[in-house]
């Protein structure tokens, strides 16, 4: 396993809809033709799985079903979105990229973005 | 010039298995998923899953879950969608597509189960 | 699963006509990729990222949308458009494509 460079920014405040978008960059030693993309969560000391997926030559990232992400990606950069988010969701978010194939394999750790979500005010009610 | 060639039609007993091969030519063979798909006589398009040839990651749609296993062979550049515990219902033609645009397509292998 | 809804089901037009195929997600996608499928044949790739033609495919197709709804157009309908359209969606697994349309000569 080798180590790999990925970039990814610092701080990130979500939409008021609970949307957050992020870059997430790899310095790849080589043409991977087989990539896989994690995003993880770190709140607490505890690390989980947001999201993953494998993509190839297409420049959109297909996740699982009921994925709270959509992707896309162009070159060695993938463009992600959580979607979903509520202020308890706050926290760091990691990008994990594996290149898969061709050997050899190499691992990529960012050091996270942390999004920050603030959940709506309720509108108040109106008098006409 | 990119072609995929598929393996022959076949006649299966229910309860059976098919292995269908999907050889591919005139391109990098592990830089592009093998995606299978399936259509019923008179039916639409129904995606069983896919291959990425280099790693041999797989995919599957959970209604094939099971019952369908995908491989493939570098060395030949082939690849192999495996459907097992066959019924009637699988009575289709079986289509191997490349790519994430599904931009090729074999002309399909033509599997009839049949008691 | 994300189910793709199009319509039409069956559309009868006539050469020269300007005719609009809908596909319709139940949820939000990324990308909608359409296919032409002729009988006898295997489908072939007409659009795909919603509004880029594939290699050799005629300017008188075009696609459009976003979210969950899309459309595909022919400008002016020829002889060799007359056959059955899919859509189909990757944003997530499985993978789904639409019921079909076909368009018949009227």
């Known amino acids: 396993c080798k180590a790999m460079h990925v970039a990814q920014p610092a701080v990130v405040l979500a939409s008021s809809r609970g949307i957050a978008s992020f870059v997430c960059e790899y310095a790849s030693p080589g043409k991977a033709t087989e990539v896989r993309v994690t995003v993880l969560r770190q709140a607490d000391s505890q690390v989980t799985e947001v999201c993953a997926a494998t993509y190839m030559m297409g420049n959109e990232l297909t996740f699982l079903d009921d994925s709270i992400c959509t992707g896309t990606s162009s070159g060695n950069q993938v463009n992600l979105t959580i979607q979903g988010l509520r202020a308890m969701d706050t926290g760091l978010y990691i990008c994990k990229v594996e290149l898969m194939y061709p050997p050899p394999y190499y691992l990529g750790i960012g050091n996270g973005t942390q999004i920050y979500v603030i959940d709506p005010e309720p509108c108040p009610d109106s008098d006409f | 010039q990119v072609h995929l060639v598929q393996s022959g039609a076949e006649v299966k007993k229910p309860g059976a298995s098919v292995k269908v091969s999907c050889k591919a030519s005139?391109?990098?063979?592990?830089s592009y998923w093998i995606n299978w798909v399936k259509q019923a006589p008179g039916q639409g398009l129904e995606w069983?899953?896919?291959?990425?040839?280099?790693?041999?990651?797989?995919y599957y749609n959970e209604m094939f879950t099971g019952r369908v296993t995908m491989t493939r062979d570098t060395s030949t550049s082939t690849a192999y969608m495996e459907l097992s515990s066959l019924r009637s219902e699988d009575t289709a033609v079986y289509y191997c597509?490349?790519?994430?645009?599904?931009?090729?397509w074999d002309q399909g292998t033509m599997v009839t189960v049949s008691s | 699963d994300i189910q793709l809804t199009q319509s039409p089901s069956f559309l009868s037009a006539s050469v020269g006509d300007r005719v609009t195929i809908t596909c319709s997600a139940s949820k939000s996608v990324s990308y909608i990729h359409w296919y032409q499928q002729k009988p006898g044949k295997a489908p072939k790739l007409l659009i795909y990222d919603t509004s880029t033609l594939a290699s050799g495919v005629p300017s008188r197709f075009s696609g459009s949308g976003s979210g969950p709804e899309y459309t595909l157009t022919i400008s002016s309908l020829q002889p060799e458009d007359f056959a059955t359209y899919y859509c189909?969606?990757?944003?997530?697994?499985?993978?789904?494509f639409g019921g079909g349309t076909k368009l018949e000569i009227k």
């Open positions: 005139g391109y990098t063979f592990t």
């Open positions: 189909q969606q990757r944003t997530t697994y499985p993978l789904t």
């Open positions: 069983m899953g896919r291959i990425a040839p280099g790693s041999g990651t797989t």
């Open positions: 597509a490349r790519g994430d645009y599904f931009d090729y």
